[in-house]
Interface confidence: low
């Protein structure tokens, strides 16, 4: 029996379409596939950012694959051809690996890139990113922010920069249609007359950096002689009620009585007849049903009841 062999894919390359980290891995069929015309050839693709311990592995019949990478580091990938056992009357046959790498030649020393990049998606509506200039740059340095997510034809530059001393230190984004639950790519590069500036790349998903508005319209309602119901309204905006967690802080006569996390817009509190003053504040956060992470809102305005009999039927501000 002659040993069945197959060649690796040809022209394996990583192509950067200018999407700030979303790259195309593409290849052509191997040479000499004539013997296997009745066969569906498969490809095993492995790729990772250089420095990562684990490879991502994909098996596909296609001649391309797309994924997001961290362009602050290089990328390495390898691919080989797989002939399924149905094609070889026996065990699966694999070709040798074809390998390729990709990286953006870094310009400038690391100290010139932006520091402390911070992005917040306020109320799931307004994205704002801010940064500090690199520690090794002069005042003539200016930074530019570009962004892309799937659905945009090409990367867009920020059009509404936040400035300090003439330098761009942040970006207010326009309305970002259909931009959540997918990777959002950002590049902040820079220019200076005196020295090259290192670019920085960032990737996140918008639903994971949401900071909601605080809850509003806090009220008290007496439920029974020893129970008071605290109620509030969800903040306005596109975040549905099912997506909120709340943290309540309740003070009775200047002593912190309760800190609790709840999922609805009510909380029932046991009280005593001796209570003279009751105050509470609430804050909100997107919960695990709608995101993997989030940022607590500011605390609501404090709502207090004092100086009157707490056994009244309804206590409203």
């Amino acid at each position: 029996d002659t040993e069945i062999k197959v060649n690796p894919p040809q022209d394996f390359e990583i192509v950067d379409p200018g999407y700030l980290g979303y790259l195309y891995l593409q290849w052509q069929p191997p040479l000499s596939l004539d013997h296997f015309k009745e066969c569906t050839v498969e490809y095993e693709l492995k790729y990772r950012n250089i420095g990562s311990e684990t490879w991502k592995t994909i098996i596909t019949k296609n001649l391309h694959y797309k994924d997001g990478f961290d362009l602050n580091k290089g990328i390495e990938a390898k691919i080989h051809t797989l002939l399924p056992w149905q094609c070889t009357n026996g065990s699966e046959v694999q070709s040798s690996w074809a390998e390729t790498t990709y990286w953006i030649s870094p310009q400038g020393i690391p100290e010139t890139k932006v520091q402390d990049m911070d992005c917040v998606y306020y109320n799931w509506q307004y994205l704002l990113c801010s940064w500090k200039p690199g520690i090794g740059v002069l005042l003539d340095t200016n930074y530019n922010l570009f962004y892309w997510y799937e659905g945009l034809d090409h990367a867009l530059q920020c059009v509404d920069y936040i400035k300090a001393d003439g330098q761009n230190i942040g970006c207010r984004f326009p309305y970002l249609e259909a931009s959540d639950y997918k990777d959002f790519y950002i590049c902040v590069n820079g220019s200076s007359e005196n020295k090259p500036i290192r670019s920085s790349y960032f990737t996140f998903q918008l639903q994971n950096i949401v900071k909601p508005l605080p809850p509003v319209y806090l009220t008290f309602t007496r439920e029974s002689s020893c129970e008071i119901k605290l109620k509030w309204s969800i903040p306005l905006g596109p975040i549905p009620a099912r997506c909120f967690d709340y943290e309540i802080e309740i003070r009775e006569d200047d002593t912190t009585l309760v800190t609790a996390t709840v999922e609805n817009e009510t909380y029932t509190l046991k009280t005593t007849n001796e209570t003279r003053q009751l105050c509470f504040v609430v804050r909100s956060k997107v919960n695990i049903y709608c995101s993997d992470d989030g940022i607590w809102s500011e605390w609501s305005d404090k709502q207090c009841w004092e100086g009157e009999d707490l056994s009244k039927k309804t206590l409203l501000r």
């Epitope: 509506q125 309305y175 508005l213 509003v216 319209y217 306005l236 905006g237 596109p238 305005d301 404090k302 501000r317």
Partner: antibody, heavy 119, light 111 residues
Framework: QVQLVQSGAEVVKPGASVKVSCKAS????????MNWVRQAPGQGLEWIGR????????HYNQKFKDRVTMTVDTSTSTVYMELSSLRSEDTAVYYC????????????WGQGTLVTVSS | DIQLTQSPSSLSASVGDRVTITCRAS??????????MNWFQQKPGKAPKLLIY???RQGSGDPARFSGSGSGTDFTLTISSLQPEDFATYFC?????????FGGGTKVEIK
């Protein structure tokens, strides 16, 4: 409880100015805008403008832009609205009204100040 | 400026009746998925009271019989079962654009 207490009624002559105050209590003053709304006798409501109690930023109705000035004193949690070059059609009850943000409505109102412009 | 047209300008109704007041804006008052439309109740000699904000959200402590609906340019305030204390004048108000503007009012009287 949230309270907005306005200054008392005024009778002023045409061409003069009036300054109405609105003292807030029972909430974090600088977290809110203060709006001013007027109502002529037997008429509807008319928005004059608003001031951000934190930054002092103002948004005026163009109709009053050249005659109105709104100011804030955070040390006393008081907002002022001054209207100049008064004429008889400025006779109205002037209200201050608290607002958290554009979409939240004016949720607490002062008791109103009657300004009568008469010679 | 955005004009608001309320109808009817007045109506007579009895206790227990279902009352509907409409407000039409000269252009859309929607933005970012929010309708910037509010409803107020005013009794003679008193300051207005917020009933509904953002078209359908109830103000603090308002009775459940008051409800708001609508989006874009057409909005409705409904009182599901009129009570004696509900006889008053009702105003719609937009806060999408400065200057904020009010409807002309609807006076609800006892039949």
């Amino acid at each position: 409880q949230v309270q907005l207490v306005q200054s008392g009624a005024e009778v002023v002559k045409p061409g003069a100015s009036v300054k109405v105050s609105c003292k807030a209590s029972g909430y974090t003053f600088t977290n809110y805008w203060m709006n001013w709304v007027r109502q002529a006798p037997g008429q509807g409501l008319e928005w004059i403008g608003r001031i951000d109690a934190y930054a002092g930023e103002t948004h005026y109705n163009q109709k009053f832009k050249d005659r109105v000035t709104m100011t804030v004193d955070t040390s006393t949690s008081t907002v002022y609205m001054e209207l100049s070059s008064l004429r008889s059609e400025d006779t109205a009850v002037y209200y201050c009204a608290r607002g958290y943000g554009d979409a939240y409505g004016m949720d607490h109102w002062g008791q109103g100040t009657l300004v009568t412009v008469s010679s | 400026d955005i004009q608001l047209t309320q109808s009817p300008s007045s109506l007579s109704a009895s206790v227990g009746d279902r009352v509907t007041i409409t407000c039409r804006a000269s252009e859309s008052v929607d933005n970012y998925g929010i309708s910037f439309m509010n409803w107020f109740q005013q009794k003679p000699g008193k300051a207005p009271k917020l009933l509904i904000y953002a078209a359908s959200r109830q103000g603090s402590g308002d009775p459940a019989r008051f409800s708001g609906s609508g989006s874009g340019t057409d909005f409705t305030l409904t009182i599901s079962s009129l009570q004696p204390e509900d006889f008053a004048t009702y105003f719609c108000q937009q806060s999408k654009e400065v200057p904020w503007t009010f409807g002309g009012g609807t006076k609800v009287e006892i039949k």
